[in-house]
Interface confidence: low
Amino acid sequence: DWVVAPISVPENGKGPFPQRLNQLKSNKDRDTKIFYSITGPGADSPPEGVFAVEKETGWLLLNKPLDREEIAKYELFGHAVSENGASVEDPMNISIIVTDQNDHKPKFTQDTFRGSVLEGVLPGTSVMQVTATDEDDAIYTYNGVVAYSIHSQEPKDPHDLMFTIHRSTGTISVISSGLDREKVPEYTLTIQATDMDGDGSTTTAVAVVEILDANDNAPMFDPQKYEAHVPENAVGHEVQRLTVTDLDAPNSPAWRATYLIMGGDDGDHFTITTHPESNQGILTTRKGLDFEAKNQHTLYVEVTNEAPFVLKLPTSTATIVVHVEDVNEAPVFVPPSKVVEVQEGIPTGEPVCVYTAEDPDKENQKISYRILRDPAGWLAMDPDSGQVTAVGTLDREDEQFVRNNIYEVMVLAMDNGSPPTTGTGTLLLTLIDVNDHGPVPEPRQITICNQSPVRQVLNITDKDLSPHTSPFQAQLTDDSDIYWTAEVNEEGDTVVLSLKKFLKQDTYDVHLSLSDHGNKEQLTVIRATVCDCHGHVETCPGPWKGG
């Protein structure tokens, strides 16, 4: 039959060339003379001339050595024609398979591979993968099958078999426990790739395994006990710097310290922060400490890291004994602002109140007193007892110094400490009204016509407070009632002045006595200008000129 089985040809053949491979033969050669030819890549198209055929015998010829890694298979067509050139057979497919020889070594894809793994990981943890390639065939032969191995490990601590490599995949894994970055931060592995599945040619490369830091070391206080001295009342005062050591990677979260006050800070007086460079714990006062309340605080501080521990570690604690130092504290008036009710106008020398301060310090310090601000100069203060007395007339109606019935005084207390300290207090005297002002009419000058005069309404004011004010009473004195009448309205807060007899144009004094609800009397002279006119007038008209 006009067929040919696939032909296998080893690569790198020795020859001699041309080398006969197979014979094409058509059974039509019994009837007529047959001529054979081949076409296709490797015959009449690139790469031309690798194969040829003996025209008359049909022998397929190989003209030179083959390279499987260049072309692994050739597909040609065989033709048979008669002498007159007529085709006697359909074109026949000829497959030539190039079989592999182990003519290539493995090649790693990199000279140096880098990988990393956390310290302290369990055996079996994958680190990295390395890859080597081999151009030879790995499907039908072992020529291109690469097997990986570790040739050497440096350093050999804690022993020389810390890693293994999967012979087929090139995956490097941890095989032993004991990876400790603090002891060995990096391993250098010399790795091999060998073809023929480990029995052939070998090539080498380097795998560098970086051991990454894990938080497997707790920060430790050094020292663990501290004594500190802090003045009382100081806020934001640096009490103590706590020092820790940590074997983990500096400036990493596994190294950076986190401090926590675990006990002893009952009143939330302290705070602790981490210094960004030194990693020290800076203990400071959040609130002022009080020597008199508690002169010693014992704090327990725990240190951990920003990163969580990767295994259960005993944490370090420090004990800080904080001694509070006594400071001479200022006397404090009790209360800081004292309200006292006192009648206005009390006699000079009369006691107003006693206003004293307490000294927070435990020693029996002597406190002396004086007035710091007394705008009207109405008061004096005994330096020893804090007794406040009147030395001037307290006047509730004095608008310059009294606001809303209150006279404000500032007093000072000074202790005899070294150096002495002072405290101030505010004394608010609420002045109780006394009926010391009579009613006063407004206005005190009027203009009125002597014919059909309009009644004059005068407002009554009294500086005192109720009940020392309205209702008011009015009375005319010194014969003013001959020509005038004075009547208080129903509300009792205005007086109506009326002219009851004719007076010639002139200016007159009207003597008006007003008294308040407490019968405090006040005499006022009203200047009345009487005009020659009718009804309402504001100023007297000029003299009448007839025509």
Epitope: T258, L260, M262, G263, Y300, E302, T304, N305, E306, A307, P308, F309, P314, T315, T317
Partner: antibody, heavy 123, light 113 residues
């Protein structure tokens, strides 16, 4: 099996001192912090204080002036003393073990509790 | 002191239904150095001491049925009972152990509808 058992007088007179003990079995007494908690009848839980494994204590500020927690390792017992009691101190008192984050540390959820003992303050 | 606020004060849920209890703290209970939330949940039945259900906000205590779960971080936490059983009727408390004094929520009474 870890067990805690509170004991003490069920009736205390006003102004006197309430004294309770907590006996621990099944675990080393110095291994974990011990808390005291109380619960007035029909009400919620109030933490009284803790004693750490090293013997240090921390108390609730609301009771601090009146409370003392101590340990007697020879008897495997913890004690609670609350002075100047009033009717407001009537409650079931529990002792409970903290799970412990670290060995010295009193912080932690309370995983083992005693059955509690009712203390009534009345004359 | 850290104030713990539970809601609701009482809750009635049908058997087999989901029950959810909330707990809010007045400050964060997340501790930066170990990324743990210092919160526990307890169950208390009448005449008995409280029983620890959940710690570290979401870790179930050994022997606690898996229908109980805890979630949340910082200041907001939740206890969930996925399918209520008759034996779950109790008062539930949250508790912070982030800082002294330890404080509890006021409790949530869970009943069957």
């Amino acid at each position: 099996q870890v067990q805690l058992q509170e004991s003490g007088p069920g009736l205390v007179k006003p102004s006197e001192t309430l004294s309770l003990t907590c006996t621990v079995s099944g675990v080393s007494i110095t291994s974990y912090p011990i808390n005291w908690i109380r619960q007035p009848p029909g009400k919620g839980l109030e933490w009284i204080g803790v004693i750490w494994t090293g013997g240090g204590t921390n108390y609730n500020p609301s009771l601090k002036s009146r409370v003392t927690i101590s340990v007697d390792t020879s008897k495997n017992q913890f004690s609670l003393k609350l002075s100047s009691v009033t009717a407001a101190d009537t409650a079931v008192y529990y002792c409970a073990r903290s799970r412990g984050v670290y060995d010295f540390d009193g912080r932690g959820a309370m995983d083992y509790w005693g059955q509690g003992t009712l203390v009534t303050v009345s004359s | 002191d850290i104030v713990m606020t539970q809601s609701p004060a009482s809750l009635a849920v049908s058997l087999g239904e989901r029950a959810t209890i909330n707990c809010k703290s007045s400050q964060s209970l997340l501790y930066s150095s170990n990324q743990k939330n210092y919160l526990a949940w307890y169950q208390q039945k009448p005449g008995q001491p409280p029983k620890l259900l959940i710690y570290w906000a979401s870790t179930r205590e050994s022997g606690v049925p898996d229908r109980f779960s805890g979630s949340g971080s910082g200041t907001d936490f939740t206890l969930t009972i996925s399918s209520l059983q008759a034996e779950d009727v109790a008062v539930y408390y949250c508790q912070q152990y982030y800082s002294y004094p330890y404080t509890f929520g006021q409790g949530t009474k869970l009943e069957i509808k």
